[in-house]
C-alpha cells in the first residue's frame, strides 16, 4: 500500500536536484579560484541536511547554518548589486560588468538559483511531486527560508554604495513583499552602507517618464532614510544596450564605469 503523501500547492523538487547542486558546486569552484578549497560533497551533505527528514513547513535559518558556514565567501562589499523582479537583466549585467556581484554570483546563490526542493517529515526522501507554496501553504518552507537566509547575509555584507536594479515596467516598482523589500532593505547596515542607489530600468527608449518619482520609490526612499542611509535613484532608459552587450561582451563599448 503506497504511503500517504502530503500534497502541497507548489511545484515539486526540481528533477535531478542532488546531481544539479553537486555539478553546479564543482563548476563554480573550478571557475572561482578563491573557492577551490570547498569540498562539494560536504556542501551537498550540508544542503541536504537542512531539509531532509524535516517538515517542509517548519524549516528555520538555523537548519541552513552548516551550509552557510561551508559557503562562506568574501565578495567586494562595495560592488554589490541587489535586484527585484528583474533577475535576468541583473545577471546579464554582472556577466559583463565583472566587478559587480549579485547574490546569484556567489556560490550559495549559484547553487540554488531557479531550483525548488523540499523533503518530508521523518523520511529521507526528497519530494519530487510537490513542495509548499509560500502564499498558499507556508512561508517557512525550505526554498523561502534558504533565500531569506542568504539574502540577509548578502545585504549585511554590503558597504559604501549599494546598487539595486528595479523593474520600471511593473505596477509596483518597489514591492515591500519582495525579498529585496522584506529582507535586504532591512539588513543593510547603516554603519557600513553610505548610499543605496536604485536603478529603475525603463521598458524602452521611448518611455521618458521620471520613474524615480513613482510612489513606491518614494516609499523605498522613506524606509532607507529612516535607517540613516542615503538614497538616490536613477532612470535607466537603455535596456537595449544591455542586451547588445550581453550578445557581444567583448565589444569595447560594453565597458561602463559607474
Amino acid at each position: 500500500v503506497p504511503r500517504w503523501r502530503q500534497q502541497w500547492s507548489g511545484p515539486g523538487t526540481t528533477k535531478r536536484f542532488p546531481e544539479t547542486v553537486l555539478a553546479r558546486c564543482v563548476k563554480y569552484t573550478e571557475i572561482h579560484p578563491e573557492m577551490r578549497h570547498v569540498d562539494c560533497q560536504s556542501v551537498w551533505d550540508a544542503f541536504k541536511g537542512a531539509f531532509i527528514s524535516k517538515h517542509p513547513c517548519n524549516i528555520t535559518e538555523e537548519d541552513y547554518q552548516p551550509l552557510m558556514k561551508l559557503g562562506t565567501q568574501t565578495v567586494p562589499c562595495n560592488k554589490i548589486l541587489l535586484w527585484s523582479r528583474i533577475k535576468d537583466l541583473a545577471h546579464q549585467f554582472t556577466q559583463v560588468q565583472r566587478d559587480m556581484f549579485t547574490l546569484e554570483d556567489t556560490l550559495l546563490g549559484y547553487l540554488a538559483d531557479d531550483l525548488t526542493w523540499c523533503g518530508e517529515f521523518n523520511t529521507s526522501k526528497i519530494n519530487y511531486q510537490s513542495c509548499p507554496d509560500w502564499r498558499k501553504d507556508c512561508s517557512n518552507n525550505p526554498v523561502s527560508v534558504f533565500w531569506k537566509t542568504v539574502s540577509r547575509r548578502f545585504a549585511e555584507a554590503a558597504c559604501d554604495v549599494v546598487h539595486v536594479m528595479l523593474n520600471g515596467s511593473r505596477s509596483k516598482i518597489f514591492d515591500k513583499n519582495s525579498t529585496f523589500g522584506s529582507v535586504e532593505v532591512h539588513n543593510l547596515q547603516p554603519e557600513k552602507v553610505q548610499t543605496l542607489e536604485a536603478w529603475v530600468i525603463h521598458g524602452g527608449r521611448e518611455d521618458s517618464r521620471d520613474l524615480c518619482q513613482d510612489p513606491t520609490i518614494k516609499e523605498l526612499e522613506s524606509i532607507i532614510s529612516k535607517r540613516n542611509i542615503q538614497f538616490s535613484c536613477k532612470n535607466i532608459y537603455r535596456p537595449d544596450k544591455f542586451l547588445q552587450c550581453v550578445k557581444n561582451p567583448e565589444d569595447s563599448s560594453c565597458t561602463s564605469e559607474i
Epitope: 524615480c212 518619482q213 536613477k234 532612470n235 544596450k241 552587450c245 561602463s256
Partner: antibody, heavy 121, light 105 residues
C-alpha cells in the same frame, strides 16, 4: 586613436537636400551607436539623430523627424545623414559623435571636427 | 523632455574655484555629463555619469548631481579653462543645457 571626420557640408537653398558623411577610424565602428549633434552659429549644442550599432534602430529629434534620415555602412566604417526639405533653421555645424556608456548612462566621448551646413537663398 | 538650464556666464579669477550649475526638474534622477568647447573646436567630454573623469582630464574638474541641480566644479582654474561648458542628460533622447561661458578674469 579614435578619429571621426565629417564631410558633405556646404551651401544649399531652402527646400534642398544634402548628405553628410562621417568616416570613422581607430575603433570597432560596428560596436558603437553613433549620433549627429548640431550647433547653430553662436548657439548651443542640439542632438539631431542617433543610430544603434548595427543600424536596426534609429532615433530623431522632433525638429528633424520626417526630413532627416540617419544610416550607416559598417563595412565602410561610415555614418550618414541624409537631409531633405532643408530650412534656414537647419543652418549649423554638424558633428558626428560616438555614443559611449553602454549600460547605465549615455554620453559622447568622441566628436568629429564638424562640417558646416548653410541653408540660404 | 527634461529641460536643462545653465547660467549664460561665470566669471572667476585664476586659481579660484568656478562652479557651473545645470538645473532641471529632479535632474538628480538622471545621469549628467559635461563638455568643454573652445572657440572653433569640437566639444570635449570632461565629466560623465555625474562625477567620473575620462582619462586625460585634469583632476581639477569634478562633478556632482542631486536634487534639481548638477554642478561642474573647476578647482584652481587656469587660463586654458576659459571655454563654453555644456551639461547633457538623457531621458530617451539627448538633452543639452544652453551652455555657460567661463571667463577667467
Amino acid at each position: 586613436q579614435v578619429q571621426l571626420v565629417e564631410s558633405g557640408g556646404g551651401l544649399v537653398q531652402p527646400g534642398g537636400s544634402l548628405r553628410l558623411s562621417c568616416a570613422a577610424s581607430g575603433f570597432t565602428f560596428s560596436s558603437y551607436a553613433m549620433n549627429w549633434v548640431r550647433q547653430a552659429p553662436g548657439k548651443g549644442l542640439e542632438w539631431v539623430s542617433g543610430i544603434s550599432s548595427w543600424g536596426s534602430s534609429t532615433y530623431y529629434a522632433d525638429s528633424v523627424k520626417g526630413r532627416f534620415t540617419i544610416s550607416r555602412d559598417n563595412s565602410k566604417n561610415t555614418l550618414y545623414l541624409q537631409m531633405n526639405s532643408l530650412r534656414a533653421e537647419d543652418t549649423a555645424v554638424y558633428y558626428c559623435a560616438r555614443e559611449d556608456g553602454s549600460y547605465m548612462t549615455d554620453y559622447f566621448a568622441y566628436w568629429g571636427q564638424g562640417t558646416l551646413v548653410t541653408v540660404s537663398s | 523632455d527634461i529641460e536643462l538650464t545653465q547660467p549664460p556666464s561665470v566669471s572667476v579669477a585664476p586659481g579660484q574655484t568656478a562652479r557651473i550649475s545645470c538645473s532641471g526638474d529632479n535632474i538628480g534622477h538622471y545621469y549628467v555629463s559635461w563638455y568643454q568647447q573652445k572657440p572653433g573646436q569640437a566639444p570635449v567630454l570632461v565629466i560623465y555619469s555625474d562625477s567620473n573623469r575620462p582619462s586625460g582630464i585634469p583632476e581639477r574638474f569634478s562633478g556632482s548631481n542631486s536634487g534639481n541641480t548638477a554642478t561642474l566644479t573647476i578647482s584652481g582654474t587656469q587660463a586654458e579653462d576659459e571655454a563654453d561648458y555644456y551639461c547633457q542628460s538623457y531621458n530617451g533622447t539627448y538633452v543639452f543645457g544652453g551652455g555657460t561661458k567661463v571667463e577667467i578674469k
